[in-house]
Amino acid sequence: SAGAGSHCQKTSLRVNFEDIGWDSWIIAPKEYEAYECKGGCFFPLADDVTPTKHAIVQTLVHLKFPTKVGKACCVPTKLSPISVLYKDDMGVPTLKYHYEGMSVAECGCR
Amino acid sequence: SAGAGSHCQKTSLRVNFEDIGWDSWIIAPKEYEAYECKGGCFFPLADDVTPTKHAIVQTLVHLKFPTKVGKACCVPTKLSPISVLYKDDMGVPTLKYHYEGMSVAECGCR
């Protein structure tokens, strides 16, 4: 598992819609793989975390002034859709094939 | 200033190119305003932090399982270019008007 000491990476995060109160409108699935971006953005930032120039700059400044400036943060840089069955305004079960931005496709340092 | 207890926002970060070792190729400016994204992504996520659906989901899961899942992170969501004077391969001082991704334009929760 990706702890604070490990490098920024995508890890599993199973989300149950009941846990977050979304089961009132999402019929199915009951849960899905959301993934989570975990780990640190350590110097030097590797290519696989696709750092922006700003993230590289912030990492270098953090290296010199660690108490003044934070490290870059490991976050989703690309998201994927999931398909959900939900109830519309009339209560009709409706399938949304692409419910965008629900699952992490890629993580990076920003 | 935006501390850990404050909400995600853009704060000043003056970067001196000498401090990060980039003065060897960037002639001018000597320093620039990079900005930094600081502060927490607390529930409920406000519109001004332009949360993705995944960030909203992760925030809700963190609310229920705070030790298992982290909060969303306050990061640059839009970057701006700066202009820099650098030396080309022949040592000719050259102006790059748009050196992309160097300064934070907007912060958000991701």
Epitope: - | P29, E31, S83, D88, M90, V92, P93, T94
Partner: antibody, heavy 119, light 111 residues
Framework: EVQLVESRGGLVQPGGSMRLSCAAS????????MNWVRQAPGKGLEWVAH??????????HYAESVRGRFTISRDDSKSSLYLQMNSLKTEDTGVYYC??????????WGQGTLVTVSS | DIVMTQSPDSLAVSLGERATINCRAS??????????MNWFQQKPGQPPKLLIY???NQGSGVPDRFSGSGSGTDFTLTISSLQAEDVAVYFC?????????FGQGTKLEIK
């Protein structure tokens, strides 16, 4: 070694025409803005014209004093710069320098060529 | 157009002494935190040579005795210890706006 060599200038009558050329070597000609700068006898330096890169669609700019009379052009395949001067006036007399550089500075200079406009 | 005005027009300095040439622009030549100001040296019968760029950076092969300073509209070229080979005309030049313009020149001689 960077070299810019201007063609021989000469004497031309007022109202006449002359074409200057400049042969470049020692650097990647197509990567640099090219300019003509002139210097009247015993006087200061005056930027005349520049031509930018292919990526800028070879955009040109001229000093007000020569606009409509002078035309700057380049041939990247020959590493050559040109200045076509028409409707010449006595005040166009001077040493014409071919210069290369960036969007920031005149970095490379030729030795210059003397153009004399006189009747 | 941005007008560049140098002072003095001519200057006589003893060998080993400091020489200072000033240049004033009719408007600021700074932008993006960068000074669009260069200095050239022209010796008799030769083309100009880049001495200082971006107000304070030495050109390639330029001796350390040459330095530049200033920002905005006021700039200075300093020769810390004048040598015989420094006899020349010095020009300031701005590249912030087309047309790129030069100062009228300052003639430096040995006293």
């Amino acid at each position: 070694e960077v070299q810019l060599v201007e063609s021989r200038g000469g004497l031309v009558q007022p109202g006449g025409s002359m074409r200057l050329s400049c042969a470049a070597s020692g650097f990647t000609f197509s990567n640099y803005w090219m300019n003509w700068v002139r210097q009247a006898p015993g006087k200061g330096l005056e930027w005349v014209a520049h031509i930018r890169l292919k990526s800028d669609n070879y955009a040109t700019h001229y000093a007000e004093s020569v606009r409509g009379r002078f035309t700057i052009s380049r041939d990247d395949s020959k590493s050559s710069l040109y200045l076509q001067m028409n409707s010449l006036k006595t005040e166009d007399t001077g040493v014409y320098y071919c210069t290369g550089g960036s969007n920031y500075v005149f970095a490379f200079w030729g030795q210059g060529t003397l153009v004399t406009v006189s009747s | 157009d941005i007008v560049m005005t140098q002072s003095p027009d001519s200057l006589a300095v003893s060998l080993g002494e400091r020489a200072t040439i000033n240049c004033r622009a009719s408007e600021s030549v700074d932008n993006y935190g960068i000074s669009f100001m260069n200095w050239f040296q022209q010796k008799p019968g030769q083309p100009p040579k880049l001495l200082i760029y971006a107000a304070s950076n030495q050109g390639s092969g330029v001796p350390d005795r040459f330095s530049g300073s200033g920002s905005g509209t006021d700039f200075t070229l300093t020769i810390s210890s004048l040598q015989a080979e420094d006899v020349a005309v010095y020009f300031c030049q701005q590249s912030k706006e087309v047309p790129w313009t030069f100062g009228q020149g300052t003639k430096l001689e040995i006293k």
